[in-house]
């Protein structure tokens, strides 16, 4: 049997070693203990007693089925520990008296149906994490749970085999910072989301399929929620839940974001917020974010022309990853606070982006992502995007673009554009001289020749240049990254050169080095302070004696260069 | 009507692999609407749920008995689901069933679509 390892901390790792008990030899010396994917089995009362000082254990995956009551006792300074995915049938109350100091407690994946006869918790007023439950066996919330908690930072429950929720059976705990949900559908939300409405500011919903959930008034009285994000993952809605998750709104006055990730809509999008209250309390949600929307009748959806009025107020919208191929310019026109929209990874081609962009579309848009999708024509593009008169920042990053035309119209505010991951070969005067930054990471380039007086940070990792571009191109450039390229060297001129330049990133290239090269950084410890990525990045290429040396510890023969 | 077709298993020592696929065979079916579970039966005992994933892949669950030993995925180009297991233990011997259902739980009763069950053996 392998034997513990301990760095001089306190900190013991004894993971994977096949241990088939709690090993002996533990002292009090020991701060961390890590017995994870072991087979242990069984930690008895004696197990623990000399790791008085120990304040994290993790005992995750090592098939534990018994712990004797006081197995824990000497355990007063422990803040973290975890017993998840283990063989733990049932919970004992006596485990946890003795941890007053417990800050973190996972007792997630074990195979219990409730949280035990009587209350585990009321010791634990210094918990600020707990998880638990299960996927297949724990079927019961009670009210005595949670008895004694009164405020967590994060509270994760699985509960996806769900029988039975003793109403307010969360309402004794106060305030909960992220509550997070595993629940398999939605019979008991509505109960649910009555005793957390007062003390949840994050809540997350995971695997839930909501396509049967119905709103019903809640049994309380004038609440302030304080929510102020909800999120949705790995659920299912229809058009008609939909409707009814929002009714739920009226009781969340405060939120201001709403979150949707790898959801399924079985719908076509024909939302109908009948009741007019719903719109003017969707008053504070400024952020709506949506990623992998599965729609299985994508091509039959709407023009959601329902719901324009729900989102006049909101400023960032991000629809990742959906299939999105079209914004109707009568919604983009309803979008009137919008200023950050992010359509990353969808179907979006110049034809429908012209209609998407209109006049009068996103009249507050500053920032608008649209990279991954199927974009071909930099000119267009920017020509598209003439009527966003706001726009600051523009990323059609990870699109194929046609090789880049002498010259295009662009938003006359631009700022920013990213053009990393295009395949373009050669930088025309397209780019547009009012940049301040400018991406083009990760192409085809072997030069750089283009003036941008406004320039401040250029970013062209992973392409081809031989050299440092000419400094004179950018007189205020602040901060250049330039890894993965083959250059080969770099002198004192060529930094000097660039009046203003706080930050250089340039490792990972195929460095010669010469004499003048090294010589150069010998003579020059200040480099440190300039090259973010210095030493360790910065290897020779050549000559083959040198080869794999850091920069900085290399030295020149002194006869080649004393000849 | 929806068949799911498991295959892949059969006799193998302690220690040792298997992969079980599950196939569904109705093209009308909409797979990846659906979630899908494995689920075990040793003789003389009751139903065990094994592990279930969601309709994108995006989530899955584990029995306790199996985590870290039991990996399942599925390729819905290929309507298929799979339950790679490493480390196989006599303990694991039992009929090894694929369920399909609406719902992302570990309650046996809440799927809808069965298969037949394919057998696993792990001699010691």
């Known amino acids: 049997q392998e034997s513990l390892s301990c760095d001089a901390s306190g900190v013991c790792d004894g993971r994977s070693r096949s241990f088939t008990s709690i090993p002996s030899g533990l002292t009090a010396a020991m701060k961390s203990l890590d017995l994870s994917f072991n087979k242990i089995t069984y930690i008895g009362h004696g197990d623990l007693r000399a790791c008085a000082n120990l304040q994290v254990l993790i005992l995750k995956s090592s098939r534990i089925n018994t712990i004797e009551g006081d197995a824990f006792y000497s355990l007063g300074s422990l803040e973290h520990l975890d017993l998840s995915d283990n063989h733990l049938s049932s919970l004992s109350s006596s485990w946890f008296g003795p941890l007053s100091s417990l800050k973190y407690l996972n007792l997630m994946g074990n195979p219990y149906q409730t949280l035990g006869v009587t209350s585990l918790f009321p010791n634990l007023t210094n918990l600020q994490t707990l998880r638990i439950g299960n996927v297949e066996t724990f079927s019961e919330i009670r009210r005595i749970d949670f008895a004694g908690l009164t405020s967590l930072n994060e509270l994760e429950i699985k509960a996806l085999s769900l029988r039975n929720y003793q109403s307010q059976s969360l309402k004794s705990i106060r305030d909960i910072h992220h509550l997070t949900l595993h629940l398999s559908e939605s019979a008991f939300l509505l109960e649910i989301f009555a005793d957390i409405l007062s003390s949840v500011r994050y809540l997350e919903l995971r695997d839930t399929n909501l396509a049967r959930f119905q709103f019903s008034p809640l049994p309380v009285d004038e609440v302030s929620s304080p929510m102020k994000k909800l999120a949705f993952r790995g659920s299912v809605l229809t058009d008609e839940s939909f409707n009814e998750l929002l009714k739920l709104l009226r009781y969340i006055l405060e939120l201001s974001e709403v979150e949707f990730d790898d959801c399924t809509l079985n719908g076509l999008g024909d939302f109908n917020p009948s009741e007019s209250d719903v719109v003017s309390e969707l008053g504070k949600v400024e952020t709506v974010t949506i990623r992998r929307l599965h729609i299985p009748q994508f091509y039959l959806f709407y023009d959601l022309s329902t719901v324009y009025s729900l989102l006049e107020k909101v400023k960032r919208i991000t629809v990742e990853n959906s299939k999105v191929f079209l914004v109707p310019c009568s919604f983009s026109q309803h979008l009137k606070s919008l200023e950050f929209l992010d359509l990353s990874e969808n179907l979006m081609v110049e034809e429908y982006l012209k209609n998407s962009a209109c006049k009068g579309a996103w009249p507050s848009l500053q920032t608008l992502v649209l990279s991954q999708n199927h974009l071909r024509s930099m000119q267009k593009t920017g020509e598209i995007l003439l009527t966003l008169k706001n726009l600051t920042s523009l990323d059609i990053s990870r699109n194929t673009f046609h090789p880049m035309p002498d010259s295009c119209q662009w938003p006359e505010k631009m700022r920013f554009l990213n053009l990393s991951s295009t395949g373009i070969r050669v930088v025309k005067t397209c780019i547009p001289q009012t940049l301040e930054v400018l991406d083009v990471s990760n192409n085809n380039l072997d030069s750089f020749s283009l003036f941008l007086p406004r320039l401040q940070e250029l970013y062209i990792s992973r392409n081809k240049l031989k050299t440092l571009p000419d400094a004179s191109l950018f007189p205020v450039l602040l901060v250049m990254k330039i890894r993965e390229n083959a250059v080969s060297t770099f002198s004192k001129d060529q930094l000097g050169s660039f009046p203003k330049l706080e930050t250089l990133e340039a490792g990972d290239n195929h460095f010669v080095c010469s004499c003048e090269l090294l010589s150069f950084t010998m003579e020059t410890p200040a480099l440190a302070q300039i090259l973010v990525d210095w030493p360790d990045s910065y290897l020779c290429d050549s000559p083959p004696r040198l080869h794999g040396h850091r920069l900085q510890d290399a030295r020149p023969s002194v006869l080649e260069c004393h000849q | 009507e929806v068949q799911l077709v498991e295959s892949g298993g059969g006799l193998v020592q302690a220690g040792g692999s298997l992969r079980l696929s599950c196939a569904a065979s109705?093209?009308?079916?909409?797979?990846?609407?659906?979630?899908f579970a494995w689920v075990r039966q040793a003789p003389g005992r009751e139903r065990e749920f094994v592990s279930v994933?969601?309709?994108?892949?995006?989530?899955?669950d584990y029995a306790s008995s199996v985590k870290g030993r039991f990996t399942i995925s599925r390729d819905n180009a290929k309507n298929t689901v799979y339950l790679q297991m490493t480390s196989l233990e006599p303990e694991d011997t039992a009929v090894y069933y694929c369920?399909?259902?609406?719902?992302?739980?570990?309650?046996?009763?809440?799927?809808?679509?069965w298969g037949q069950g394919t057998p696993v053996t792990v001699s010691s």
């Open positions: 369920a399909a259902g609406p719902y992302y739980t570990g309650s046996s009763d809440r799927y809808d679509y």
């Open positions: 109705e093209l009308a079916f909409d797979f990846d609407g659906y979630n």
């Open positions: 994933i969601n309709r994108s892949g995006g989530s899955t």
